[in-house]
């Protein structure tokens, strides 16, 4: 018994004064203990507790069941125990079957021996089956047997407890090992949309999904800078053994341009945490923005090629889009699509192919879109550079020779005087008279000039060339006349086109 | 300081028996498991059998179950191992050892962590 310096409380001793004592079943269990201060007797095996306030602890008959730890305790709480075996051959093990084991942890398997003096008290696997090779297990009698540094992989694993007895392994019932996996990564979470564009008024659903080795991941949605509880609703499923789902929904059934922002949704288990994000924005009605993708006064050759091309965001998705030109609409010609295919995409792209343009197919071109809220447009004004055509060339009765061109741009008109026969006209002859007329055609058109110059300042016979140009190139006309005497022959005008 | 002192070996023929004694000296170990282990020439040393010095469980490894018997006299303070049908395979110098931490790997292989060790004795099986 324990020995203690004078005037210190000693703890109770105990009769009789072993540590382990083994009886027979059916045989007296009589304990006494022995303490001035003395307050109970408690039993205890598995999870099974019982008290007693006598100081001598009598079972008459002793039961299996009876196994356990007996521990006096007087009034200072210092207690004594002496551990009792009841030899029942009918009942080697004393049997808890749960069994729960935290990975890389022990966990115990409850199979208490009722008789210590046993051989090789080990595991065994069910059915014959050999245990992983790795499992490693410290035997005790008095609280069962603990397997070490419990594996993921011996989950589900059968077991027993067993003793060897005349050469036979007698078993436990059987024990089946569940295993709570430990968290070795952070939690996965990814989110149904990465953004959300919704008018007021109209619900916002979002879902997380979080992915982890078992339910035990904690999960939250937040606002970010807000500390405000959100509404969500939970989904979970587990897919095989450590493969836990949880889908985690939050919603604001009538959303408000308030509560536009980023909303987290954050995870975390014992080894970390992981979060993502959505953004919310809530606008009070729908719009429709263009942008056009070249400039909307544009310049073409007559002839050539041109795309009108437009982006443009529409929220809510884009109901009508139509080009226009004088009033007509393009049934084809024009190509209109998204510009991407992502599910939160509000950007879309609008073209309109014009192919071979005439002069007279210059003009304001007019893209139109609308949506459910909001209708919006934008003009393309259209110039086709057309080169100079001269449509009237006259000796006037007031002997002025007059030209009459029109391209676009404008052209200019020069004058040029050939003496004789020469082909070469050099001189240049100064107009009397230039002006732009105004064209009767559409506007972007071309435009229309007049020039005229004095004949009767020409003194010998010759050619007299009229040569409209602009930029894109040049068209001449020319005026012959002779002398007869004093008098002038009646012009013979005819045109030359230079390409 | 505790002493382990084995004693008992010698040369036998196969099919007889022998018994080794381990007097334990120093203190008494009672929740301790008192073991035998043996070494062969260039082999490792293997578990052989153990009991429990207060609780007298006992354990054996596979090649000797049925063939070998551990046992202790707590008034004598000695552990004995009772060799019955000797191999040659049996030839070995056996070591006497003491610890408080026995355990079982993949239910058939046993190990100790012996905190106390003994000199040894051989014991050869002629054939």
């Known amino acids: 018994q324990p020995s203690v310096s004078p005037g210190e409380p000693s703890p109770p001793s105990i009769h009789p004064g072993k540590s382990d004592l083994i009886v027979r079943v059916g045989d007296e269990i009589r304990l006494l203990c022995t303490d001035p201060g003395f307050v109970k007797w408690t039993f205890e095996i598995l999870d099974e507790t019982n008290e007693n306030k006598q100081n001598e602890w009598i079972t008459e008959k002793a039961e299996a069941t009876n196994t356990g730890k007996y521990t006096c305790t007087n009034k200072h709480g210092l207690s004594n125990s002496i551990y009792v075996f009841v030899r029942d051959p009918a009942k080697l093990f004393l049997v808890d079957r749960s069994l729960y084991g935290k990975e890389d942890n022990d966990t115990l398997v409850r199979c208490p021996l009722t008789d210590p003096e046993v051989t090789n008290y080990s595991l065994k696997g069910c059915q014959g089956k050999p245990l992983p090779k790795d499992l490693r297990f410290i035997p005790d009698p008095k609280a069962g047997i603990m397997i070490k540094s419990v594996k993921r992989a011996y989950h589900r694993l059968c077991l027993h407890c067993s003793v060897d007895q005349e050469g036979k392994s007698v078993l436990s019932e059987k024990f089946i090992l569940k295993v709570r996996p430990a968290f070795k990564a952070v939690p996965v979470v990814s989110v149904s949309k990465a953004s959300y564009l919704l008018r007021e008024g109209e619900e916002f659903t979002v879902t997380c999904t979080i992915k982890d080795v078992s339910s035990s991941v904690y999960s939250t949605w937040k606002r970010e800078n807000s500390q405000t509880k959100l509404q969500e609703k939970y989904n979970s499923w587990h897919h095989g053994d450590f493969n836990y789902e949880r889908q985690a929904t939050l919603t604001i059934s009538s959303a408000r341009v308030n509560d536009s922002g980023v909303f987290m949704c954050y995870a975390n288990n014992t080894f970390g945490s992981a979060n993502v994000t959505t953004t919310l924005e809530v606008v009070d009605k729908g719009f429709i923005n263009i942008f056009p993708m070249i400039n909307t006064t544009v310049f073409v050759n007559d002839g050539e090629n041109v795309d009108l091309i437009v982006e443009y965001e529409a929220f809510p998705k884009p109901e009508h889009q139509q080009w226009i030109y004088m009033n007509r609409t393009f049934t084809d010609k024009w190509e209109d699509y998204p510009k991407s295919e992502n599910e939160s995409n509000i950007r879309y792209v609008s073209e309109l192919h014009l192919t071979r343009l005439k002069g007279t197919e210059g003009g304001t071109y007019t893209f139109l879109v609308s949506n459910s809220d909001v209708n919006a447009a934008i003009a393309f004004n259209v110039y086709v550079n057309t080169k100079p055509e001269i449509l009237t060339y006259d000796r006037l009765v007031n002997g002025m020779l007059q030209c009459v061109a029109a391209g676009f741009p404008e052209p200019t008109i020069d004058w040029y005087f050939c003496p004789g026969t020469e082909q070469r006209c050099s001189a240049s002859v100064l107009p009397v008279d230039v002006q732009t007329l105004n064209s009767s055609g559409p506007p972007f058109g071309k435009l229309v000039v007049q020039s005229s110059i004095d004949s009767s300042a020409f003194k010998h016979n010759g050619t007299v060339e009229c040569k409209a140009y602009n930029d894109v190139g040049k068209t001449s006309a020319y005026f012959n006349f002779a002398f007869k005497g004093n008098n002038k022959e009646q012009i013979h005008p005819h045109t030359l086109f230079t390409p | 300081q505790v002493q382990l002192v084995e004693s008992g070996g010698g040369l036998v023929q196969a099919g007889d028996s022998l018994r080794l004694s381990c007097a334990v000296s120093?203190?008494?170990?009672?929740?301790?498991?008192m073991a035998w282990l043996r070494q062969a020439p260039g082999k490792e040393r293997e578990f052989v059998a153990a009991?429990?010095?207060?609780?007298?469980?006992?354990y054996y490894q596979d090649p000797v179950k049925g063939r070998f018997t551990i046992s202790r006299d707590k008034a004598k303070n000695t552990v004995y191992l009772q060799m019955n049908t000797l191999k040659p395979e049996d030839t070995a110098t056996y070591i006497c050892?003491?610890?408080?931490?026995?355990?079982?790997?993949?239910?058939?292989?046993?190990?100790?962590?012996?905190?106390?060790w003994g000199q040894g004795t051989q014991v050869t099986v002629s054939s």
């Open positions: 050892a003491a610890g408080q931490h026995l355990s079982g790997l993949g239910g058939s292989a046993w190990s100790i962590e012996g905190d106390y």
């Open positions: 009991i429990h010095w207060s609780l007298g469980s006992t």
């Open positions: 120093g203190r008494t170990l009672s929740n301790y498991f």
